[in-house]
């Protein structure tokens, strides 16, 4: 069940970040995180596509990794609230 939940969350994580045109920072964060980007030095926002961790998101910057986890945690909270709300609404019918 936990694996399924993680799968749903990761999918939602990518979709939501794609849709957040206002959240330019988040979008670039995930663009770099998932797809990597060309060239670039350490002070630069660009970074090489290389390292993989357990949920399939790429990043070479530890702070960026922490930001990704924070976004994912926020989405988990939002999705969790929505799910609880849906269950509540079903119960009312």
């Amino acid at each position: 069940r936990r694996d399924v939940a993680h799968g749903i969350l990761n999918e939602a994580y990518r979709k939501v970040l794609d849709q957040l045109s206002a959240g330019k920072h988040l979008q670039s964060l995930v663009a770099r995180g998932v797809g990597g980007s060309l060239g670039g030095g350490a002070g630069d926002d660009a970074e090489p596509l290389s390292k993989r961790h357990s949920d399939g998101i790429f990043t070479d910057s530890y702070s960026r990794y922490r930001k990704q986890m924070a976004v994912k945690k926020y989405l988990a909270a939002v999705l969790g609230k929505r799910y609880k709300q849906r269950v509540k609404n079903k119960g009312r019918r």
Partner: antibody, heavy 117, light 112 residues
């Protein structure tokens, strides 16, 4: 104040595995970045990897990829580091450490792992 | 990986004198979030390391103000302005900007 208490010293045979535990108290365990660092006798420090327990998300140093597994049990606020295919060069003190502000603010007391035939 | 080069390997300083340790990284440690994740640790024999400085120059609470960190980009310095007997230890710099996180080789500080 976060406190980290590690399991006791281990003596292992080459080719075997070791699993070291690190129990955290005084913080929200699932929301901590738990790292593992080792130090061979008289040598410097070497980062092995990390786990973010809330998602069981791990990141390993390339050097240890495929040989190290970091896990966490949220119910007991305990992280584990398992190192397989042990060799004599793995004889070291293994530390768990917790990130705060992007650096290791809290350290366990260390666990000595001796690999000897 | 980022290579962290510390110098000198060891340092003997008289009590009350200044001790300076240098640390050089093979790549800039300035992150895109504007922070520089360069840290200094102190390790005494038989003890785990202890955080002294993070973000290149921010002193850990409880650390005496004789310890200071400076530098940016690739060049960093830890200064002990007036060495005390209890400062005898090995000091490590390490970077937390880029994976894999990497450490300097350490500098042993002794009393002359």
């Amino acid at each position: 104040e976060v406190q980290l208490v590690q399991s006791g010293a281990e003596v292992k045979k080459p080719g075997s595995s070791v699993k070291v535990s690190c129990k955290a108290s005084g913080g929200t365990f699932s929301d901590l970045y738990m790292h593992w660092v080792r130090q061979a006798p008289g040598q410097g420090l070497e980062w092995m990897g990390l786990i973010y327990p809330i998602f069981a998300d791990t990141r390993y140093a390339q050097k240890f990829q495929g040989r190290v597994t970091i896990t966490a049990d949220e119910s007991t606020s305990t992280a584990y580091m398992e190192l397989s295919s042990l060799r004599s060069e793995d004889t070291a003190v293994y530390y768990c450490a917790i990130d705060q502000d992007g650096s290791f603010a809290y350290w366990g007391q260390g666990t000595l792992v001796t690999v000897s035939s | 990986d980022i290579v962290m080069t510390q110098s000198p390997d060891s340092l003997a300083v008289s009590l009350g004198e200044r001790a300076t340790i240098n640390c050089k990284s093979s790549q800039s440690l300035l992150d895109s979030d504007g922070k520089t994740y360069l840290n200094w640790l102190q390790q005494k024999p038989g003890q785990p390391p202890k955080r002294l400085i993070y973000w290149a120059s921010t002193r850990e609470s409880g650390v005496p103000d004789r310890f200071s960190g400076s530098g940016s980009g690739t060049d960093f310095t830890l200064t002990i302005s007036s060495l005390q007997a209890e400062d005898v230890a090995v000091y490590y710099c390490w970077q937390g900007t880029w994976f894999d996180l990497t450490f300097g080789g350490g500098t042993k500080v002794e009393i002359k």
